[in-house]
């Protein structure tokens, strides 16, 4: 037989299939030119000493073979003795070490068998109603195809699926989407309506992430508030590894997960922008405000579930730094200014009502006054901090108020609103004899004492009604008792107590009269 022809004789080996797992497979035959044809196949197993024979049986029942030696590809013309216009059955027999291995058969009309290409180029992946949609441009001159997909996960082997018939310039396929594991997909095509025609090669892998991107375990911590009113946020992260199927290992596009930090500043809600998203590598500095922070994992399908962390406000208060003056037309706050053109956010909230929304005011950008102070004023009519209760005041500053991570804390302090002088007056002043020349004076704590750092001291005034002599005794803000000594028996005294703040002298309590009885000896 001539090598270019199909030989209509018995092949030169015994005809028994060993049925082993190795051997020839994936035979495909197609037309490659007007009169030229090609068949190719894969061989699984050791290739040394293997001889391949492409077998062909015509519809008449006559059979022939091409001997290809060690080659797994053969080209022949329509003059090789194989009927190209009629249906033929082809298979490969591989002979090695005195045994023959046989491929599955393909039955087809060679003339109509065009070599179809797999989807080429960019395969677009999207999510549609809980499924995966793949879409691609139909290869040139190949409109009208049957399409199959195969997919696997890191722990499963290939599963085959059908995309159905395609008849357009773009082709698409709906495939299953896994919630929590990555998948590898491959697609192949063959001519529509020609059963038995050969499938194209499988496409390059399409790597698809899980619907839910993996949520990393993270831990946040914040450093102490620095002198600049900022504190560094730090992150400890558990390395997460998304397990990938075999064909997606290495730099596989499509399964990337990006992690971002979403920062929400809870304090000072009147500022322009409350939320900012940053790359996870860029850990920000924060003011002393309260924040919610979340790590958001996103893949090509969007963000996954996130874990939110709450960073409480830094409650460290400055000893004073804030000066409040109450005048006839209103109230003005003064504090050490920051740089030129700084926007300030002044926030206050009654103590004990931390759950409720704070009152918040944003100043226009301002420069320091000649004394280096910044100010904020409001009229009496506004009613701001008008009630006689304790308020927690925080002032934040930023030269770029729209940039969430550039705010800093200027100060955090307490202030007693309304008429603090009168409201702070100590009540229930009582006098008890202590010794022959001394008494103990007690009083109920001033309302100002509920306001940390506001009450500077109590002052106890004692007046001798005979001589009109007055003595004043300063008392620590934590004490509500003092002993008055060197008093004379039989003399009438009056005692009063007041509560002072750093910037305000309190009002005296109602005078309390007392005297030490004269001791009569027997």
């Amino acid at each position: 037989c001539r090598t270019s022809e199909c030989c209509f004789q018995d092949p030169p080996y015994s005809d028994a299939d060993s049925g082993s797992a190795s051997g020839p497979r994936d035979l495909s035959c197609y037309r490659i030119s007007s009169a030229g044809y090609e068949c190719s196949w894969q061989y699984e197993g050791p290739t040394a000493g293997v001889s391949h024979f492409l077998r062909c049986c015509l519809s008449s029942g006559r059979c022939c073979y091409f001997a290809t030696g060690s080659a797994t590809r053969l080209q022949f013309s329509d003059q090789a003795g194989v009927s190209v216009l009629h249906t033929v059955t082809l298979w490969v027999e591989s002979w090695a070490r005195n045994r023959t291995e046989k491929s599955p058969e393909v039955t087809l009309q060679l003339y109509k068998s065009v070599k179809y290409k797999p989807p080429l180029g960019d395969i677009k992946v999207s999510k549609l109603a809980g499924q995966l949609r793949m879409e691609w441009e139909t290869p040139d001159n190949q409109v009208g195809a049957e399409v199959q997909f195969r997919h696997r996960t890191p722990s499963s082997s290939w599963k085959l699926g059908d995309c159905g018939p395609q008849d357009d310039d773009t082709e698409s396929c709906l495939c299953p989407l896994e919630m929590n594991v990555a998948q590898e997909f491959q697609l192949r095509r063959r001519r529509l309506g020609s059963q038995g025609s050969s499938w194209s090669k499988w496409s390059s892998p399409v790597c698809v992430p899980p619907e839910n991107p993996p949520q990393p375990q993270v831990r946040f911590s914040v450093e102490q508030l620095g002198r600049d009113g900022r504190r560094r946020l730090t992150l400890k992260e558990q390395p997460t590894q998304l397990e990938l199927p075999e064909g997606c290992q290495g730099p596989a596009p499509g399964v990337e997960v990006t992690y971002q930090l979403q920062l929400h500043m809870l304090s000072c809600p009147c500022k322009a922008k409350a939320t900012r998203t940053l790359p996870l590598e860029k850990m920000p500095y924060l003011s002393g405000a309260a924040y919610n922070v979340a790590v958001i994992s996103s893949n090509r399908f969007g963000p996954g579930p996130n874990q939110t962390w709450h960073i409480p406000a830094d409650t460290h208060t400055e000893p004073v730094a804030l000066n409040i003056s109450v005048g006839t037309n209103g109230t003005t706050m003064y504090w050490p200014a920051r740089a030129q053109s700084t926007t300030y956010c002044i926030e206050w909230q009654p103590v004990g009502q931390e759950g409720s929304l704070a009152t918040c005011n944003l100043t226009a950008p301002q420069d320091p006054d000649p004394a280096g102070m910044a100010t904020y004023s409001w009229s009496r009519e506004s009613g701001a901090m008008g009630q006689e209760k304790c308020y927690h005041i925080t002032i934040f500053a930023s030269a770029h108020p729209k940039k969430l991570t550039l705010w800093s804390t200027v100060l955090s302090t307490y202030h007693f609103g309304g008429n603090a002088s009168a409201a702070g007056t100590p009540h229930h002043v009582s006098v008890k004899n202590h010794s022959l020349d001394s008494v103990s004076v007690d009083w109920a704590p001033s309302l100002l004492s509920t306001c940390p750092g506001v009450l500077k001291e109590y002052v106890v005034r004692c007046r001798d009604e005979d001589s009109n002599q007055v003595s004043e005794h300063p008392v620590q803000p934590t004490e509500t008792q003092v002993t008055l000594s060197d008093l004379r028996a039989g003399v009438a005294y009056t005692v009063q107590v007041r509560a002072d703040t750093a910037w305000l002298r309190g009002a005296w309590s109602q005078p309390q009269r007392f005297s030490i009885k004269v001791q009569v000896s027997d």
């Epitope: 594991v181 558990q238 997460t240 590894q241 962390w309 709450h310 960073i311």
Partner: antibody, heavy 117, light 107 residues
Framework: QVQLVQSGAEVKKPGASVKVSCKTS????????IHWVRQAPGQGLEWMGI????????SYAQQFQGRVTMTRDTSTSTVYMELSSLRSEDTAVYYC??????????WGRGTLVTVSS | EIVLTQSPGTLSLSPGERATLSCRAS???????LAWYQQKPGQAPRLLIY???SRATGIPDRFSGSGSGTDFTLTISRLEPEDFAVYYC????????FGQGTKLEIK
């Protein structure tokens, strides 16, 4: 020695709140995260949330969000877990647990909270 | 969330025997972030194994852990009377979830 000591058993009415404490000793309080885990009678373990004693930073399990508050007092090295709007299904033993390297290496003895009308 | 399923629910064995407890995850547990705890009646859980196979301080070497991905095993080579308890697996690779527990009882 290193230990977590929890407050005593509580009986509460539905709708009320409970605050359980967990006093730590024998190690640097601010160096380890504390978790809260609960166990309903005859049931398994359920994670509730975590607090960083250093800055008071917290994160809660989705199902407890809005009902649980974890706080700490660095002066007494104590962590607190408050659960509000109690219902009968909140009857459980509540454990605080110290986090080693992500896992829980030390547990408190638990606090039984009974919610009953 | 990752669901952990422990099997068997109850295991009846005699002292001296070998116990094998299984824990299967609904999805891969990243980097073997899996721990095993022992709990006796009226007591808090106690850490036995972390990182799927590392023994916690003070845990006897008859306890060993193995596995990766979605399948994990706790083995007690020779049961002692004090080993009869409930055992929980826990993943800590993505938030925190526990298995429903395996009760190891005396036969």
């Amino acid at each position: 020695q290193v230990q977590l000591v929890q407050s005593g058993a509580e009986v509460k009415k539905p709708g009320a709140s409970v605050k359980v404490s967990c006093k730590t000793s024998g190690y640097t309080f601010t160096s380890y995260y504390i978790h809260w885990v609960r166990q309903a009678p005859g049931q398994g373990l359920e994670w509730m949330g975590i607090i960083n004693p250093s800055g008071g930073i917290t994160s809660y399990a989705q199902q407890f969000q809005g009902r649980v508050t974890m706080t700490r007092d660095t002066s007494t090295s104590t962590v607190y877990m408050e659960l509000s709007s109690l219902r009968s299904e909140d009857t459980a033993v509540y454990y605080c647990a110290r986090e080693g390297d992500w896992y829980f290496d030390l547990w408190g003895r638990g606090t039984l909270v009974t919610v009953s009308s | 969330e990752i669901v952990l399923t422990q099997s068997p629910g109850t295991l009846s064995l005699s002292p001296g025997e070998r116990a094998t407890l299984s824990c299967r995850a609904s999805q891969s547990v990243s980097s073997s972030y899996l721990a095993w705890y022992q709990q006796k009646p009226g007591q808090a859980p106690r850490l036995l194994i972390y990182g799927a196979s590392s023994r916690a301080t003070g845990i006897p070497d008859r306890f060993s852990g193995s596995g990766s991905g979605t399948d994990f095993t706790l083995t007690i080579s020779r049961l002692e009377p004090e080993d009869f308890a409930v055992y929980y697996c826990q993943q800590y690779g993505s938030s925190y979830t526990f298995g429903q527990g395996t009760k190891l009882e005396i036969k």
